[in-house]
């Protein structure tokens, strides 16, 4: 995974704006899913909180030390000025842990983006036309990824010749929206912390 060099940007911390939009968009989508899929377990009381990024990314582990070590004294030996090509941390001196945290957030977004796009392609084929993913939510994920802009291999959308299992897709949608909302809260907290520091 590459952690490239920064391009200065005089503006305020733009990723905070994107992360707030993301949290709003996923919350709205989840609300819509709860209402539309009323016969599916889609409330936070009913759902199983599972995470598709488990064992694949380490966002909580990578980002938690940022809050625990506000003065970054224990990170000074590893401090460096590499950051992202994107505008999120432009013109900031960044610790290794901070770069790792943002890189992990990017990987999370990429994984969820692939899952959501794959699911949406299936839902668009559903004769019941019951629910589709909010294009705004997909666009906001894109925007935040572009703002982070890590050099990363693009993951092709999972295409399948199989007939879509609409029943499973809707159950999975509820599980993933809940998991993604929790991750969006984490991302927003990280961005708020970085904006304040």
């Amino acid at each position: 995974r590459n952690l490239p060099v920064a391009t200065p940007d005089p503006g305020m911390f733009p990723c905070l704006h994107h992360s707030q939009n993301l949290l709003r968009a996923v919350s709205n989508m989840l609300q819509k899913a709860r209402q539309t899929l009323e016969f599916y377990p889609c409330t936070s009381e009913e759902i199983d909180h599972e995470d598709i990024t488990k064992d694949k990314t380490s966002t909580v582990e990578a980002c938690l030390p940022l809050e625990l070590t506000k003065n970054e004294s224990c990170l000074n030996s590893r401090e460096t000025s590499f950051i992202t090509n994107g505008s999120c941390l432009a013109s900031r001196k960044t610790s290794f842990m901070m770069a790792l945290c943002l890189s992990s957030i990017y990987e999370d977004l990429k994984m969820y983006q692939v899952e959501f796009k794959t699911m949406n392609a299936k839902l668009l084929m559903d004769p019941k036309r019951q629910i589709f993913l909010d294009q705004n939510m997909l666009a906001v994920i894109d925007e935040l990824m572009q703002a982070l802009n890590f050099n990363s291999e693009t993951v092709p959308q999972k295409s399948s010749l199989e007939e879509p299992d609409f029943y499973k897709t809707k159950i999975k949608l509820c599980i993933l929206l809940h998991a993604f909302r929790i991750r969006a809260v984490t991302i927003d907290r990280v961005m708020s912390y970085l904006n304040a520091s």
């Epitope: 377990p41 009913e46 999975k172």
Partner: nanobody
Framework: EVQLVESGGGLVQPGGSLRLTCAAS????????MGWYRQLPGKQRELIAH???????TYADFVKGRFTISRDNVKNMVYLQMNSLKPEDTAVYYC????????WGQGTQVTVSS
């Protein structure tokens, strides 16, 4: 390593009943959503019933009212009670998680025929 062992299948007459059992071990946690899937001859595997860790259930339209999914989180078991069986229910039945369903058991064959 994940292990899923399905049992309880067999030959049954139309209108009859069967109870399928799934023993789950390894990294299949009791807080995962679980489901029963079936694979008809020449078709792909499809989800037919789903149960959350807290016992909330849903069913595919074609088994609603006939099949009942349940689980025992302590024993790591998932069950499928199948009533009013029809010839078109003839298939291999599997249990698995809803997410991360990478490893599959051997399944259990259910044949409904007179």
């Amino acid at each position: 390593e994940v292990q899923l062992v399905e049992s309880g299948g067999g030959l049954v007459q139309p209108g009859g009943s069967l109870r399928l059992t799934c023993a789950a071990s390894g990294s299949i946690a009791s807080n995962s959503a679980m489901g029963w899937y079936r694979q008809l001859p020449g078709k792909q595997r499809e989800l037919i019933a789903h149960i959350t860790s807290r016992g909330h259930t849903t069913y595919a339209d074609f088994v609603k009212g006939r099949f009942t999914i349940s689980r025992d989180n302590v024993k790591n078991m998932v069950y499928l009670q199948m009533n009013s069986l029809k010839p078109e229910d003839t298939a291999v039945y599997y249990c698995n998680k809803i997410l991360h369903s990478d490893y599959w058991g051997q399944g259990t064959q259910v044949t409904v025929s007179s």
